[in-house]
Each structure stands twice: as structure tokens, then as C-alpha cells.
Amino acid sequence: LRLLDHRALVCSQPGLNCTVKNSTCLDDSWIHPRNLTPSSPKNIYINLSVSSTQHGELVPVLHVEWTLQTDASILYLEGAELSVLQLNTNERLCVRFEFLSKLRHHHRRWRFTFSHFVVDPDQEYEVTVHHLPKPIPDGDPNHQSKNFLVPDCEHARMKVTTPCMSSGSLWDPNITVETLDTQHLRVDFTLWNESTHYQILLTSFPHMENHSCFEHMHHIPAPRPEEFHQRSNVTLTLRNLKGCCRHQVQIQPFFSSCLNDCLRHSATVSCPEMPDTPEPIPDYMPLWEPRSGSSDYKDDDDKGSSHHHHHH
């Protein structure tokens, strides 16, 4: 959470001389309350915008817009404090609009905007606009707050931002997972244009449960330049456990820009459909059990194995 670096922050508009200042988030009117204070903002609108920094990076920013109520309290409005709180870290950033001239009623409702709060992908923010001076203790609140969830890097608009690109958002592995038989799973995906290794993480689950019944990790060495953008396929050997049939395959890249914190892509294979009608019970019982060629369970130390190769 920070302010966009290179922009001259302006809030003046026809009929109002105004300057934007950094704020400690504790306006002086908290400490020295005034008798007459303005009413709260009428509406706050927040949306996501993408701006470029002076270093040419594209960053997500919050576009905050609000309007004033059309009451006489605008005569006592000296400015506004904008506060953004990042929920998960409790980091807060504030700026103050300082009105250098008195507001007057005019034919249009007064409207203010600010688009300089740089935010992080997949984070939640509380945006508060506080009219100044702030009310006396027990006075009517003159602020309005709204929450805003910044989309994650999967979102089309976010994908092209620098923080998302750094975490590998432009790579689309287009994963396909296919069950070859009860013991083998084939995974195909597109390699990115970087000589970096990948990891395939296989987690298997019983039909209706979220506790894994099998886990396997497979390492894919860094491809050569001629293999960039090619399809790579891997055959993973499954643990032959009855009912351990739902498989989640996650591909973790290790790009130089994000190392072990790159965006992962996953695909899931569901358990085969159970027949709607139960098998009919025979009206006779066999005198012996047919011999089974293989056991349903393997030894615990029989780990899944795999092999892979790249397609050209």
C-alpha cells in the first residue's frame, strides 16, 4: 500500500482552490474539536484502475470518487481525509484534501476524485472518506466507508500489471489431465519461455472427502530454449488405493522473477461416475470367491513414480 510516485497531486477544480497533502491519519480536529462540522459524503464509488509509475511499471490503483450532500454544511467544509486500510496487514495510508477557498453552492453537485493509492492483487481494502473538521465526541459521524476487494492475478485487467507479471501471470500452461487407467495419470502442459524447472504436485482424495489419501511430487528439469512454448507431458503413477480417485494436479513454476512464490495452475480429475442403479444381487451365492490377480493395496513404501518428455 503506497502512493503513486510521480504524479503532482491536484484536487483543485473550477470554483475551488485545493491542495493534496500527506496525512498522519490523525487530523488536528480530533485533538481540537470544532463546534460546527460538515455532514458526511453522500456517495463513495470505488473502482480499480491501472496506472504507470515513473519507472514505467503498470500498477493497480484505487479510483475513489465521492460527492457532497447539498446542505448548508458545505459552508463549514474545510477539506477531506482519505484513508485506505489494508485488512490483512492493518497498514493504513492517508491523504488530506485541504480547501484553500470556501465552497459555495453551484448548479452541479460537488464531486471529488483521487486515483493514487497503489494496491496489491488479491487484497481487501477499507476506504474511508472523512469530511473535515471531524465531529466533536458524540457528534454525528461525518465519514463514509466502503470495502473493495482487488482481483487476483487471474483477472484479465490484473494480469498485465507489473506485480502480477512478476509472479508469472502471463504464463498459461493450458493443463490437460487424463486418466490412462486406474494407476496412471497423464499430465500435459505448455512450458514458458524461461529456462527454469517446474514441479508437479499430485494430491489425490477420496470421492467426497478433503483429506488426501495420496501425495506425490514430480520434478521437471529446466527446458532448453528450443523447448520453450512446447507441450510437455508426464505420466504419473498413482497409488492403487480403492476410492482414492479424485486427483488434483498443481504445476508450480520457479521463474526467476518469483522463485518459489510463483502463481500455480491446477487441474482436477473427478472420480468416475457411480452407476445410478445398484448392481442386481444374484439369486444364488457362489461356492467360492474368484481369485484376484492383484491386491487393492500396495505397501506403504511403494511410492508413486513418473516419467516425462517434451513434445516438439
Epitope: 485488512l87 490483512n88 493504513r92 481487501e124 474511508t128 470495502n147
Partner: antibody, heavy 118, light 107 residues
């Protein structure tokens, strides 16, 4: 001194209700999001709920969703947890906790005990 | 929701030993991870936040590392007062889930 003091715990029958309070002092309460965390006897920590500084963002753990309500009164420097439709598994010590700027929770209350039993 | 796992669930070590506890997230959480120490009958205390930043007042024998899905809490030289249960907690997005805990005692 920065302090959080919980109150309102007690014994209640399954299906009953309780309201927990947390009184904050020594810091600007209205600048912080606040959390409730609980710990069942002999078990680990379970995050319960968070409320942002101006109450515009609220989240709950799945285990309490629809039954518990978090709220705050910044003028009174107080945080609340209204617990309805209580179950045996809600028996725990309930802590209110203040997040640290940068992450984690650096200020905790001493906890208040809730016992749900018939 | 992202699951948090910790290993081992308990450990015994001698005074002066180097102790390592690992915490794993089922999906990447960047460096949004905190570690807590809880002594019997007490409330938890923050040791480390942002995966590797030491909370003020915490002895320097505690350190944290990791990013993405795999994290480590290390006590470089175990002291008698370090007997406690240690929890990791992810805070990238709500729910801010805790790990199941690792109980540390002295041999």
C-alpha cells in the same frame, strides 16, 4: 499501556446465546481492525472473525458463520461477539486480538471462557 | 480455503539444540505468515510476522524463513523458557487460519 480485556463468558446450554465484549485501552482503537480467536480445551488456536476499523469489512470462520456476529463501537473503544445457537464445540477460551501493522496479532486479551453444556 | 499444516506435531530436544519447525500452506500465501508462541495457561505471543521479521522484544535465537507455501521457524539454541506450543498463521486473505501447532519440550 496497551490493553485488551474480554468479558461476558460463562456457561450456557446448547442452543443458547452469549455476548462477549472486549474493552480496548492505550491505543487508537478506531484505527485498527480487530479479531476474535478461540481455543478449545487442550486444542489449538482457531481464528473466529475479523472486523475492519470502520466495520465495512467483516469475515467469519466457516464454523461460526450464520451464528456469530462481530461488531464494534469506536466511541466506546469496544469490540463485541454475539454468539447464538451455541453448540458443544463452541466451548473455548475466547480472545480478542489486535493486528500488528505489517501482519500477525501483537496484542491479546487474557481471554474469557465460554462453556456450552447441557 | 487454504489449509495449514505443521510438522512435527511435537518434539523433544536438549537445551542448546537447534530446533526447526515447518509450516506448509496448501496454496501460495506469499510472505503473509506469522509465528506465535503459547506457554501453558497463557495467551499467544507474536514471535515473527511477514514470514521472517522478528517482533520487537523477541530473542534473536528465533528466526523465520520461507515464502510461497513452505515456511520454517528456527530456534538456534533451545532454552528452558522456550517450552511452549508454536503456531503458524496465514494472513494473506480471510480466513486467517492457524496451523495445528507444534509442542516443544526439553529432553
Amino acid at each position: 499501556e496497551v490493553q485488551l480485556v474480554e468479558s461476558g463468558g460463562g456457561s450456557v446450554q446448547p442452543g443458547g446465546s452469549l455476548r462477549l465484549s472486549c474493552a480496548a485501552s492505550g491505543f487508537t482503537f478506531s484505527s485498527y481492525s480487530m479479531n476474535w480467536v478461540r481455543q478449545a480445551p487442550g486444542k489449538g488456536l482457531e481464528w473466529v472473525s475479523i472486523i475492519s476499523s470502520r466495520s465495512s469489512i467483516i469475515h467469519y470462520a466457516d464454523s461460526v458463520k450464520g451464528r456469530f456476529t462481530i461488531s464494534r463501537d469506536n466511541a466506546k473503544n469496544s469490540l463485541y461477539l454475539q454468539m447464538n445457537s451455541l453448540r458443544d464445540e463452541d466451548t473455548a477460551v475466547y480472545y480478542c486480538a489486535r493486528p500488528k501493522v505489517g501482519g500477525g496479532m501483537d496484542v491479546w486479551g487474557q481471554g474469557t471462557t465460554v462453556t456450552v453444556s447441557s | 480455503d487454504i489449509q495449514m499444516t505443521q510438522s512435527p506435531s511435537s518434539l523433544s530436544a536438549s537445551v542448546g539444540d537447534r530446533v526447526t519447525i515447518t509450516c506448509r500452506a496448501s496454496q501460495g500465501i506469499s510472505n503473509y505468515l506469522a509465528w506465535y508462541q503459547q506457554k501453558p495457561g497463557k495467551f499467544p505471543e507474536l514471535l515473527i510476522y511477514a514470514a521472517s521479521t522478528l517482533q520487537s522484544g523477541v530473542p534473536s535465537r528465533f528466526s523465520g524463513s520461507g515464502s510461497g507455501t513452505d515456511f520454517t521457524l528456527t530456534i538456534s539454541s533451545l532454552q528452558p523458557e522456550d517450552v511452549a506450543t508454536y503456531y503458524c498463521q496465514k494472513y494473506n486473505r480471510a480466513p486467517f487460519t492457524f496451523g495445528p501447532g507444534t509442542k516443544v519440550d526439553i529432553k
